[in-house]
Interface confidence: medium
């Protein structure tokens, strides 16, 4: 049989952050190559990463077409053949379908992880500080422009701010439905800030990792009386 020497892929894993989406699997190929197929529940299968010796396939271009769709993916193990025309690959022999493994369903809007946010700036005016979170670009496109995280998630996305006096470790928190915080601070005190993106309606992957810490008295901030 043409498929006797092929090993089915296993440990299929979706790795997705801010919609950059890669399907990974094992094992490293020996005498075989892989082809990945992706489809929506109601759509046709589309082949990607033809006859690759990699154990990953970037499916971002497909899933960003509609991040609210549910996607199915599968990885075919295809025997590697030598022929008179040099190295060729065949989708099985005698019309056989090579072995494949299904990935779990992937719903980008629900499953993509939130990337680490970045504090764009902070500005102090008297005893108030305005902290602005960068509205990151995603790879989701509309009208030839890349949409931001806020564009895609709308009001489903909030940010949590952690802030504390440089001289102490007691953290306070604030939340915002936009990309800005306005918080009260003690005059004459320096504060440090870190933010986290959150989608409260999710059950998994609700929170991003914390942003890098930014502290007052460093370049990123601005002070006004």
């Amino acid at each position: 049989s043409g498929t006797t020497n092929t090993v089915a892929a296993y440990n299929l894993t979706w790795k997705s952050t801010n919609f950059k989406t890669i399907l990974e699997w094992e094992p490293k190929p020996v005498n075989q190559v892989y082809t990945v197929q992706i489809s929506t529940k109601s759509g046709d299968w589309k082949s990607k990463c033809f006859y690759t010796t990699d154990t990953e396939c970037d499916l971002t271009d497909e899933i960003v077409k509609d991040v609210k769709q549910t996607y199915l993916a599968r990885v075919f193990s295809v025997p590697w053949r030598n022929s008179t025309h040099g190295k060729e690959t065949l989708f099985g022999t005698h019309g056989e379908e090579p072995p494949f493994t299904n990935a779990r369903k992937f719903l980008p809007y629900r499953d993509t992880k939130l990337g680490q946010p970045t504090i764009q700036s902070f500005e102090q005016v008297g005893t108030k500080v305005n902290v602005t979170v960068e509205d990151e670009r995603t790879l989701v496109r509309r009208n030839n422009t890349f949409l931001s995280l806020r564009d895609v998630f709308g009001k489903d996305l909030i940010y949590t701010l952690y802030y504390w006096k440089s001289s102490s470790s007691g953290k306070k928190t604030a939340k915002t439905n936009t990309n800005e915080f306005l918080i009260d601070v003690d005059k004459g005190e320096n504060y440090c800030f870190s933010v986290q993106a959150v989608i409260p309606s999710r059950t998994v992957n609700r929170k991003s990792t914390d942003s890098p810490v930014e502290c007052m008295g460093q370049e990123k901030g601005e002070f006004r009386e």
Epitope: D66, R141, R142, D151, G154, K155, T176, N177, T178
Partner: antibody, heavy 124, light 108 residues
Framework: QVQLQQWGAGLLKPSETLSLTCAVY????????WSWIRQPPGKGLEWIGE???????RYNPSLKSRVTISVDTSKNQFSLKLSSVTAADTAVYYC??????????????????WGKGTTVTVSS | EIVLTQSPGTLSLSPGERATLSCRAS???????LAWYQQKPGQAPRLLIY???SRATGIPDRFSGSGSGTDFTLTISRLEPEDFAVYYC?????????FGGGTKVEIK
């Protein structure tokens, strides 16, 4: 066809609390945000705040300390309370539906259904 | 907050003419969250355009929106008698959601 019907006291004295209610007919509260907007006589529109069916709120920071917006899903209505009113709060108050429309990878937001407005006058 | 500045304050035109209304934001606004409304005396505002370019249901195609970033435009290609009203732009991307001061389109 969704319609918003609003009511509440039209004449208040300074320091009193303004209280308005907006009922949603022909549709559900769920899946939308519900806003209050006001318009002082001869002036432009000012957004006061909004509430989701789940009760999550967003307020205009300039009014936040005085505003409470609440929702009653059993009655399919939402309400506005504005405390410690002054003459500067005299306005026509509108309720509106803020629709999240998802299309081609992202959301649009717009107020597509409005109440007819309630005139509120604050005078001693 | 994002300040929306509309110009001109008043536009005096005749029926059949073209009206061009400007809305300038104090900082960049996602076009997804930019809308235009029409208001006639004694009435609630009425949605015309959402997402900066898309016409709301039932809005005639003489109304069109354009622009991005900080500059947005509402164009009425040929004014009809019922188009004389006040027009507001609005952003719903950053709290507080804000409206422009309005442009009154009046009969010349």
């Amino acid at each position: 066809q969704v319609q918003l019907q609003q009511w509440g006291a039209g004449l208040l004295k300074p320091s009193e609390t303004l209280s308005l209610t907006c009922a949603v007919y022909g549709g559900s509260l769920s899946g939308y945000y519900w806003s209050w907007i006001r318009q002082p006589p001869g002036k432009g529109l000012e957004w006061i705040g909004e509430i989701g069916a789940s009760g999550s709120t967003r307020y205009n920071p300039s009014l936040k300390s005085r505003v409470t917006i609440s929702v009653d899903t059993s009655k399919n209505q939402f309400s506005l309370k504005l405390s410690s009113v002054t003459a500067a709060d005299t306005a026509v108050y509108y309720c509106a539906r803020d629709t999240p429309y998802y299309y081609e990878g992202g959301y649009y937001y717009y107020m597509d259904v409005w109440g007819k407005g309630t005139t509120v006058t604050v005078s001693s | 907050e994002i300040v929306l500045t509309q110009s001109p304050g008043t536009l005096s035109l005749s029926p059949g003419e073209r009206a061009t209304l400007s809305c300038r934001a104090s900082q960049s606004v996602s076009s997804s969250f930019l809308a235009w409304y029409q208001q006639k005396p004694g009435q609630a505002p009425r949605l015309l355009i959402y997402g900066a370019y898309s016409r709301a249901t039932g809005i005639p195609d003489r109304f069109s929106g354009s622009g991005s970033g900080t500059d947005f435009t509402l164009t009425i290609s040929r004014l009809e008698p019922e188009d004389f009203a006040v027009y507001y732009c609005q952003q719903a991307g950053v709290v507080p959601y804000t409206f422009g001061g309005g442009t009154k389109v009046e009969i010349k």
